[in-house]
Amino acid sequence: MKVLQEPTCVSDYMSISTCEWKMNGPTNCSTELRLLYQLVFLLSEAHTCIPENNGGAGCVCHLLMDDVVSADNYTLDLWAGQQLLWKGSFKPSEHVKPRAPGNLTVHTNVSDTLLLTWSNPYPPDNYLYNHLTYAVNIWSENDPADFRIYNVTYLEPSLRIAASTLKSGISYRARVRAWAQCYNTTWSEWSPSTKWHNSYREPFEQH
């Protein structure tokens, strides 16, 4: 039994880091493998993660952590019974994938303005809370070409757009994702999408 693709890990910079790897053949990850992880910290003790299957030869493990600070560094040991298959380390602050925003809501009752709001996925005491920026994706269910991205570079989790920038009388969907420049993170997953019917009053033409 050998590791074909070494574990790569990303942290949500809160409580979970996710590690994925591939074995050289079909593997029952949960029964055959264990990933031990330990904070490089005087008198810390190792924790065990039981991996799950992620495709035939792929494994994934969700490492539970007590918060994350920038100095954190973990040693990782992948075991198959008594055999050490791989040894490495992981610094969560250097591999951050933020949590996805939630509670995306489209408010259509503000005159002819669409107000999109969502929730910051982090509590106020987390470092990322004040460092997230967002991308909002809006698309038409009827027209695949009608697809747009709005970059929200301010901290407030909201976006206002004129309803007239979208076509009237058709349904749209929106979703939002987050990233943090301070840690050069990857983008989060997209939030669940929300749907609304776009309608607004066309302005009278002046003759």
Epitope: L39, V40, F41, L42, L43, S44, E45, D66, D67, V69, S70, A71, D72, N73
Partner: antibody, heavy 120, light 108 residues
Framework: EVQLLESGGGLVQPGGSLRLSCAAS????????MHWVRQAPGKGLEYVSG????????YYANSVKGRFTISRDNPKNTLFLQMSSLRAEDTAVYYC?????????????WGQGTTVTVSS | EIVLTQSPGTLSLSPGERATLSCRAS???????LAWYQQKPGQAPRLLIY???RRATGIPDRFSGSGSGTDFTLTISRLEPEDFAVYYC?????????FGQGTKLEIK
């Protein structure tokens, strides 16, 4: 209420031995690494020794290595420091402290201290 | 072994003023954790800041920590009468624990 209560301090002659105890209440000792920190009269804080949650790993400052032994009895919620070959410079208030991994080495609970005096 | 040097040794200020206490490490400690403690006469120390900048439970927001590499700072934005005490920085690393020698904050 979370508390640590040290005992076992006293007057001892140079070369003598003493065993300090620390009784924990209000929390489960086995969930935390535990440490001893001391403070000589009128001086600053000095780290002495620590022990991991389960007791499998220990650490000692160079000044006490080979003379002091830290141990714990998790079922009894008690931490110990066995001190031998004591010297005058070991005279200090000894504090039992708790470290939370969440606090990354921050010592969030301290006992009131027990005084050890090494003198002839 | 890493040495932590605190400055100044004594700081004389009045209530309402801003206090800035320094802690310097003898080498880069970016892979370790810095904490700050307050100690009043006859009492055990109290944890104020951990992980360089995070306030411990129940610590007022006038206390803040910052820094990286070798230089760290504890700032008390507006001194209250109860803040006059001795302050210690502490480094908790992979292989050792070290305290600074302390800064005494006294009333001017």
């Amino acid at each position: 209420e979370v508390q640590l209560l040290e005992s076992g301090g006293g007057l001892v002659q140079p070369g003598g031995s003493l065993r300090l105890s620390c009784a924990a209440s209000g929390f489960t000792l086995s969930s935390y690494a535990m440490h001893w920190v001391r403070q000589a009269p009128g001086k600053g804080l000095e780290y002495v020794s620590g022990i991991s949650h389960s007791g499998t790993s220990t650490y000692y400052a160079n000044s006490v290595k080979g003379r002091f032994t830290i141990s714990r009895d998790n079922p009894k919620n008690t931490l110990f420091l066995q001190m031998s070959s004591l010297r005058a410079e070991d005279t200090a208030v000894y504090y039992c402290v708790r470290v939370r991994v969440l606090y990354r080495g921050g010592m969030d609970v301290w006992g009131q201290g027990t005084t050890v005096t090494v003198s002839s | 072994e890493i040495v932590l040097t605190q400055s100044p040794g004594t700081l004389s200020l009045s209530p309402g003023e801003r206090a800035t206490l320094s802690c310097r490490a003898s080498q880069d400690v970016s892979s370790a954790y810095l904490a700050w403690y307050q100690q009043k006469p006859g009492q055990a120390p109290r944890l104020l800041i951990y992980g360089t900048s995070r306030r411990a439970t129940g610590i007022p927001d006038r206390f803040s920590g910052s820094g990286s590499g070798t230089d760290f700072t504890l700032t008390i934005s507006r001194l209250e009468p109860e803040d006059f005490a001795v302050y210690y920085c502490q480094l908790y690393g992979a292989t050792s624990v070290t305290f600074g020698q302390g800064t005494k904050l006294e009333i001017k």
